[in-house]
């Protein structure tokens, strides 16, 4: 069940989630919780027209959870 | 169908470093929110979790084991590696691939049986 | 380190009977519990994930439960292939634990 090329995914469709309707995959604990239990959007920049992404800001390497600064709020789809 | 088969080297001598290969089908580790973890089971006892990889590269040691692993991914083979250096017979195992979703591990292997033997 | 204290190790009943096996988490996990049940030959396979929820194929009269700091892995009437062993796992962070696992036998 080969995927096509990542690219294309990318630009044609917004990531896929891996939690239930409801549901958030959370970056700072990596794994699903409620959407209403992530953290509020960062601030958008002056100038910005769009939100500016959620992006996690973890270490490459970890031993614990907790080292990320944020989250993805992309809700489950059925 | 997601799949994943890990192999191994099968017996290996005290202080030598111990490379498995999980390969994996069915999913890819670079959609957003996958990874891929090992566990270990020595005969007799409970799984013991030891490592796991994201998708982004985020990796994620065992304290306890930390200075001895090594987890690597190679996403266009479908693959991710585990290294433990300077193995000891209190490594001996079945050594399991696993992989993670957005609710722990949904999908495991069959395991790799490892003996650490002088 | 959150420790996952699961009970009873071993656990002797009889097909048709009700048990139930739990695990308690040292710190709050939430809902991020997995039941895995694994065969004689090693065979691992997931249960349960969120603490409740059913995985496809995995027959009704498995389910999951919490109250508190305790999870429980319920089966509703036991069979036969149901006499192996079971783990739960927390996921809600690394270091992931596992429950000491517990030992279904025949009575």
């Known amino acids: 069940m080969r995927r096509g090329p990542r690219s294309l995914r990318g630009r044609d469709a917004p990531a896929p989630t891996p939690c239930v309707p409801a549901e958030c995959f959370d970056l700072l604990v990596r794994h699903c919780v409620a959407c209403g239990l992530l953290r509020t959007p960062r601030p958008k920049p002056a100038g910005a027209s769009s939100p500016a992404p959620r992006t996690a800001l973890q270490p490459q390497e970890s031993v614990g959870a907790g080292a990320g600064e944020a989250a993805l709020p992309l809700p489950g789809l059925l | 169908q997601v799949t994943l088969k890990e192999s191994g080297p099968g017996i290996l001598q005290p202080s030598q470093t111990l490379s498995l290969t999980c390969s994996f089908s069915?999913?890819?580790?670079?959609?957003?929110?996958?990874?891929v973890g090992w566990i270990r089971q020595p005969s007799g006892k409970g799984l013991e979790w030891l490592a796991h990889?994201?998708?982004?590269?985020?990796?994620y040691y065992n304290p306890a084991l930390k200075s001895r692993l090594t987890i690597s991914k190679d996403t266009s083979k479908n693959q991710v590696f585990l290294k433990i250096a300077n193995v000891d017979t209190a490594d001996t195992a079945t050594y399991y691939c696993?992989?993670?979703?957005?609710?722990?591990?949904?999908?495991w292997g069959q395991g790799t049986a490892l003996t650490v033997s002088s | 380190d959150i420790q996952m204290t699961q009970s009873p190790s071993s656990l002797s009943a009889s097909l048709g009977e009700r048990v139930s096996l739990t695990c308690r988490a040292s710190q709050d996990i939430g809902s991020s519990l997995n039941w895995l049940q694994q065969e004689p030959d090693g065979t691992i396979r997931r249960l349960i994930y969120?603490?409740?929820r059913l995985d496809s194929g995995v027959p009704k009269r498995f389910s999951g439960s919490r109250s508190g700091s305790e999870y429980s892995l319920t089966i509703s009437s036991l069979e036969s292939e149901d006499f192996v062993d079971y783990y739960c796992?927390?996921?809600?962070?690394?270091?992931?634990?596992f429950g000491g696992g517990t030992k279904l036998e025949i009575e």
């Open positions: 696993g992989r993670i979703g957005g609710y722990g591990f949904d999908y």
């Open positions: 069915g999913f890819s580790l670079s959609t957003f929110a996958m990874g």
């Open positions: 969120a603490t409740s």
């Open positions: 990889i994201w998708w982004d590269d985020v990796k």
């Open positions: 796992l927390q996921y809600a962070n690394s270091p992931y634990t």
